[in-house]
Amino acid sequence: AAPCPDACCPHGSSGLRCTRDGALDSLHHLPGAENLTELYIENQQHLQHLELRDLRGLGELRNLTIVKSGLRFVAPDAFHFTPRLSRLNLSFNALESLSWKTVQGLSLQELVLSGNPLHCSCALRWLQRWEEEGLGGVPEQKLQCHGQGPLAHMPNASCGVPTLKVQVPNASVDVGDDVLLRCQVEGRGLEQAGWILTELEQSATVMKSGGLPSLGLTLANVTSDLNRKNVTCWAENDVGRAEVSVQVNVSFPASVQLHTAVEMHHWCIPFSVDGQPAPSLRWLFNGSVLNETSFIFTEFLEPAANETVRHGCLRLNQPTHVNNGNYTLLAANPFGQASASIMAAFMDNPFEFNPEDPIPVSFSPVDTNSTSGDPVEKKDETPFGVSVAVG
């Protein structure tokens, strides 16, 4: 094949090589950019900056090599449009530093930076960590800082990410209140800070105030939905990023719902309880306190991480006619109490009924939780018919 006279020439089915001396000063408008998986650039002294716009449209890029060129600066967001990048070789350029943000979000198997006049500072603490942890092939490069010795020997005691403290109100927060949160940021070289409020949705009206080093956040007219929602303060410096999440507990009274009994492996009287703080529960059977046993007990489903409502069952293992009756669930917290009742009829007397026999009741309780484990069974007979009346 005839030699390629262009600044950049195809290499394989989805590669591009740009090696003609001084032909590039940016990477705009590379031919066939959208399908490129490999880009090799060499001897480009005028290519000094690599920025976000340079790699736009290179979404399939996996290998990027820029060597023996004039690269002095790589923007922190330079690789935003190349999320599949796995090999990055920037050796023998003029780089003094490279931000941790540049490689954040990439899954780099290889990062080559040898032959650059690196300047040892806290901004390279992340790279020193890669070297310590054996990541990206960095240890094999024995990276040096220009006139300062090995990167591995750089003192790092003062190189920490920002320290965050979020102050939340001590006092009880009620529905409708306004809540002021303050995030105190400490650390060297603070660059940016802010709040992440994606979970809040309709839980409150949000107003931000202040700036580094003290950020304020007012949550106005809070609702009970604010419970279990993360409010996150973040801050960044040249070493890295820190985040602290807090939750605001909004007090509200207990509430309870009961549903018709259902037969599964066992019988279940489904319930839902809500309230903040979490309510204590008690069951009554025909008006008397129900003592929980391995045959009748409260079982909670796994709670959703971001809500206060708890769902569960009063679980009955092989109930008989003596378990027919009125079940009441009482829920109480310091802000109120609630109850709900339901009639359950599991079966007629399977043992022959004598009107003079006493009907026993099981009595006294505790709030409980969990998931199944009956013996694997073979049934010779079908169960008795059941009827359930809603009270």
Partner: antibody
Framework: EVQLQESGPGLVKPSGTLSLTCAVS?????????WTWVRQPPGKGLEWIGE???????NYNPSLKSRVTISVDKSKNQFSLKLSSVTAADTAVYYC????????WGQGTLVTVSS | SSELTQDPAVSVALGQTVRITCQGD??????ASWYQQKPGQAPVLVIY???NRPSGIPDRFSGSSSGNTASLTITGAQAEDEADYYC???????????FGGGTKLTVL
């Protein structure tokens, strides 16, 4: 499948406290099952001692209630039995099992009360 | 009363049917479970609830209940069925469990 294993001293002095532990493997003690202790004096029948749920609910045999404590340690996936003020009548093979059906049992451990 | 009563001993000819009974007031209210115990071994659950057999238990074992009596029936007894059999159920109060005194089954 679930397996249970009792452990503890085989000899306890009269008036002392019998302490046994049941390690649960092949399943979580925090499942929807209760866990129980049963004993069997030599040559005699089975006697239910008590049961516990991982959230702390417990029930005891009324005849032993004043002397029995059953507890659960979720972090170790085990539950325990303490029986105080023992006498020779408490000499028995002690079993742990899964309630309510007692569908899984430990192999049992003989505890002798003797000075 | 919080008692379950069993016959101390029962015998059956090989291949014949035998019924082991358990009596008590609690059985008017609750199902019995049945356990088989061979010398030096832990008991094994054979029937629970309303005639449920755990997996691995042969179908010659079955349970039934009437009035204050629960029964374990072995249809076509085998030599390996020779063992002690215990019933248990919830006590009448529902708050604790009780065992019968056990029945020694001999297969002739």
């Amino acid at each position: 499948e679930v397996q249970l294993q009792e452990s503890g001293p085989g000899l306890v002095k009269p008036s002392g406290t019998l302490s046994l532990t049941c390690a649960v493997s092949g399943g979580s003690i925090s499942s929807s099952n209760w866990w129980t202790w049963v004993r069997q004096p030599p040559g005699k029948g089975l006697e239910w001692i008590g049961e516990i749920y991982h959230r702390g609910n417990r029930n005891y045999n009324p005849s032993l209630k004043s002397r029995v404590t059953i507890s659960v340690d979720k972090s170790k996936n085990q539950f325990s039995l303490k029986l105080s003020s023992v006498t020779a009548a408490d000499t028995a093979v002690y079993y742990c099992a899964r309630a309510p059906w007692f569908d899984y049992w430990g192999q049992g451990t003989l505890v002798t009360v003797s000075s | 009363s919080s008692e379950l009563t069993q016959d101390p001993a029962v015998s059956v000819a090989l291949g014949q049917t035998v019924r082991i009974t358990c009596q008590g007031d609690a059985l008017r209210s609750y199902y019995a479970s049945w356990y088989q115990q061979k010398p030096g071994q832990a008991p094994v659950l054979v029937i629970y609830g309303k005639n449920n057999r755990p997996s691995g238990i042969p179908d010659r074992f079955s349970g039934s209940s009437s009035g204050n009596t629960a029964s374990l029936t072995i249809t076509g007894a085998q030599a390996e069925d020779e063992a002690d059999y215990y019933c248990n159920s919830q006590a009448s109060s529902g708050n604790h469990l009780i065992f019968g005194g056990g029945t020694k089954l001999t297969v002739l």
